[in-house]
Interface confidence: low
């Protein structure tokens, strides 16, 4: 950081004074204060003095010695006063120019430190600040009036009292311009417009700044539409809206219209897109499949994308069967709508039970007619599985029910040991039944499968097992024979 | 990230002088428009505004005090310190720095504190 | 000085209540006023400045109204975090004073 003689804050001289500011740094420096006449500057590498052999009250101020080639960005800064009895203000600029809300500092400097306890801030000829006026004084700086308003846009002077006498500084006039933070705000609405040839439309532009110069306009494609303009202003904001009106639109009315503003900030514009048709329309689509397989107990959702012109006149979900007579609860049937035009219609099926499974039908109704849409629900169940002894055909032969969704495989194992179930060091023999016969196959229902293992003499201390598997789940049955040899023979006739 | 933290004498006797620090972190004290005060919390009571000190060394008391209270700063250690004499049990309180800033526009100072540090508590007993 | 008069000094709420606490001055400040959340043992926080700017990072369920001497701090959904002592400050004026405080507790 670069050094400065003298090495005071401040310092505080007569006029004609000579005054030698010296700043040393560690490479070379500038000086940087106020704009006043009579000074020298005399560079020397590392230090740069400057010096007056005749302070006047124009040479108050606050003087930083600035090193360029530091990146840290040190300074050093010394304030001077030339107490002149004849002028206590020095006045950097007589026009300050602020934006709204901003602080404006009003640059009339003190030049004798001493003066500060009986300074103020008064509008020209005297007259007292604007009420909510707040405002604070530095000696160094001058007067800053806190979160300028564009209505304190006035010529003010500094006072001081010197000897019982307030004494005036020259006037500085404060210019506060309103903030334009960018092109003028837009709206057009409708965001999408549908009509029947023939309909009346409304397509509304309207634009809002907080500056009365921007221009708004409403075009048709890429043709300036000439629409007279309303103006208004409220909330602090000018507003002009532009109102198009269409008593029987046709098919020339259709395609894409913009609303466009603009001032000296920018210009902005919104679009949105109107669409004549010959008649009602009504169309139904899911972006799901319309079959859908679901595990038993787990939950879905069914989703309908409507899109129809005029607006729904009625809408239900309805159970088509084949089990219950249920319907489904509205609570669960929810409907969205994306714009005008679109809407979303879910119907949520949690915890799914048997007797759900079914056809589930959307049904829509506008001027345009009527319109369904039909989702297949298909439950899926693990295995279930069943296993009994009989003869056929006179040869001995376990029996292997499985009923699930979707349609099981079956395998058998034979084991040694009673057990529930075999494992991999008990089994002894492992046949897959590729075709097992089908029993029943129905929309909806599980699918039962029938799988037969001949078996001419039933091993004493052994277990067979019709084990079934789906991609759900799997199911298992162990048979153990009660004891040796039973059952061997068939039955008598 | 701006961090502030209080630190000076939990205990202080009737008639001493109370020399608070406050030291802190993620921005300068030489920057445009910045600033730290004090404020104090006697216990169950209100927050009372005690002294900023800004940037250019400007400094700002609260009547009721000023001539017991002394603000300032050191720019290379990033240290601002204030000193009570005549210490009371009245003053016993939780003394908290806070920083203002920073600038909004080029020639606006905020004017609140954004930024606080924990306290510290100090009790005048003999 | 500027007396800043707070009410209410405590109140009882439930998450999800809709919060309103009061800040008058006993003169026009204009709109120099902030608001803060202080919770034992931790710094204080700003959560509006100039009556109703809110202050990045916090949350938009907290918003604050008015300017000259009637200022409102209200939190529209009161969430668990929220519950702690709530102060103003005006700074319009020299000496800076500050609201005796509303400490929100859970019904």
């Known amino acids: 950081i670069p050094v400065i003689e003298p090495s005071v804050p401040e310092l505080v001289v007569k006029p004609g004074a000579t005054v030698t500011l010296r700043c040393v740094g560690n490479g070379s420096v500038e000086w940087d204060g106020p704009p006043s006449p009579h000074w020298t500057l005399y560079s020397d590498g590392s230090s740069s003095i400057l010096s007056t052999n005749n302070a006047t009250f124009q040479n108050t101020g606050t003087y930083r010695c600035t090193e360029p080639g530091d990146p840290l960005g040190g300074s050093a800064a010394i304030h001077l006063y030339v107490k002149d009895p004849a002028r206590p203000w020095n006045v950097l600029a007589q026009e300050v120019v602020v934006f709204e809300d901003q602080d404006a500092l009003l640059p009339c400097l003190l030049t004798d430190p001493v003066l500060e306890a009986g300074v103020s801030l008064v509008r020209v000829r005297g007259r007292p600040l604007m009420r909510h006026t707040n405002y604070s004084f530095s000696p160094w700086h001058g007067f800053t009036i806190h979160r300028a308003k564009f209505i304190q846009s006035q010529d003010y002077q500094c006072s001081a009292l010197m000897g019982g006498r307030k004494v005036m500084s020259i006037s500085i006039r404060l210019k506060v311009q309103k903030v334009i933070p960018g092109p003028p705000a837009l709206t057009l609405v409708p965001a999408e417009l549908v009509r029947i040839r023939g309909e009346a439309a409304q397509i509304v532009c309207s634009a809002s700044s907080v500056d009365v110069n921007f221009d708004v306009f409403l075009q048709h494609n890429n043709t300036k539409l000439a629409i007279p303009q309303q103006s208004d202003f409220h909330n602090n904001r000018y507003q002009k809206v532009l109102t198009l009106n269409l008593d029987q639109v046709d098919f020339q009315h259709a395609g894409n219209y913009s609303c466009v503003a603009s001032n000296v900030q920018g210009k902005h514009s919104t679009s949105m897109f109107f669409r004549v048709v010959e008649s009602a329309y009504l169309n139904l689509s899911s972006e799901q499949n319309l079959i859908q397989e679901v595990t038993v107990g787990e939950g879905l959702n069914l989703k309908v994308m409507v899109e129809a012109y005029p607006g729904l006149q009625g809408f239900n979900w309805t159970y088509l069967g084949p089990f219950s007579d249920h319907q489904p609860e509205p609570k669960l049937a929810n409907a969205t709508t994306k714009d005008t035009y679109r809407h979303t219609f879910t119907l949520s099926l949690p915890r799914l039970k048997p007797s759900e499974a079914g056809r589930y039908s959307f049904l829509a109704r506008n001027p345009g007619g009527w319109r369904a849409l039909t989702f297949e629900l298909t439950l899926r169940y693990p295995p279930e599985v069943s296993v009994i002894w009989t003869f056929i055909n006179g040869s001995g032969t376990l029996l292997c029910a499985a009923s699930g969704y979707p349609q099981p495989n079956v395998t058998w194992l034979q084991c040694s040991g009673h057990t529930d179930r075999c494992d991999e060091a008990q089994v002894l023999q492992v046949w897959d039944d590729p075709y097992p016969e089908v029993l029943s196959q129905e929309p909806f229902h599980k699918v039962t499968v029938q799988s037969l293992l001949t078996v001419e003499t039933l091993e004493h201390n052994q277990t067979y097992e019709c084990r079934a598997h789906n991609s759900v789940g799997s199911g298992s049955w162990a048979f153990i024979p009660i004891s040796a040899g039973a059952h061997t023979h068939p039955p008598d006739e | 990230e701006v961090t502030l933290k209080e630190s000076g004498p939990a205990l202080v006797k009737p008639t001493q002088t109370l020399t608070l620090t406050c030291t802190f972190s993620g921005f300068s004290l030489t920057t445009y428009g910045m600033g730290v005060g004090w404020i104090r919390q006697p216990p169950g009571k209100a927050l009372e505004w005690l002294a900023n000190?800004?940037?250019?060394?400007?400094?700002y008391y609260n009547p009721s005090l000023k001539n017991r209270l002394t603000i300032s700063k050191d720019t290379s250690k990033n240290q601002v310190v204030l000193t009570m004499t005549n210490m009371d049990p009245v003053d016993t309180a939780t003394y908290y720095c806070a920083r203002i800033g920073p600038i909004k526009y080029p020639t606006a100072p905020y004017r609140y504190f954004d930024f606080w540090g924990q306290g510290t508590m100090v009790t005048v007993s003999s | 000085d500027i007396q800043m008069t707070q009410s209410p000094s405590s109140l009882s709420a439930s998450v999800g209540d809709r919060v309103t606490i009061t800040c008058l001055a006993s003169?026009?400040?204009?709109?120099?006023l902030a608001w803060y959340q202080k919770k034992p043992g931790k710094a204080p926080k700003l959560l509006i400045y100039y009556a109703s700017s809110l202050q990045d990072g916090v949350p938009s369920r907290f918003s604050g109204s008015g300017s000259g001497t009637d200022f409102t701090l209200t939190i529209s959904s009161l969430q668990p975090e929220d519950f702690a002592t709530y102060f103003c400050l005006q700074d319009s004026e020299y000496p800076w004073t500050f609201g005796g405080g509303t400490k929100v507790e859970i019904k």
């Open positions: 000190i800004w940037w250019d060394d400007d400094k």
């Open positions: 003169e026009d400040i204009y709109d120099n």
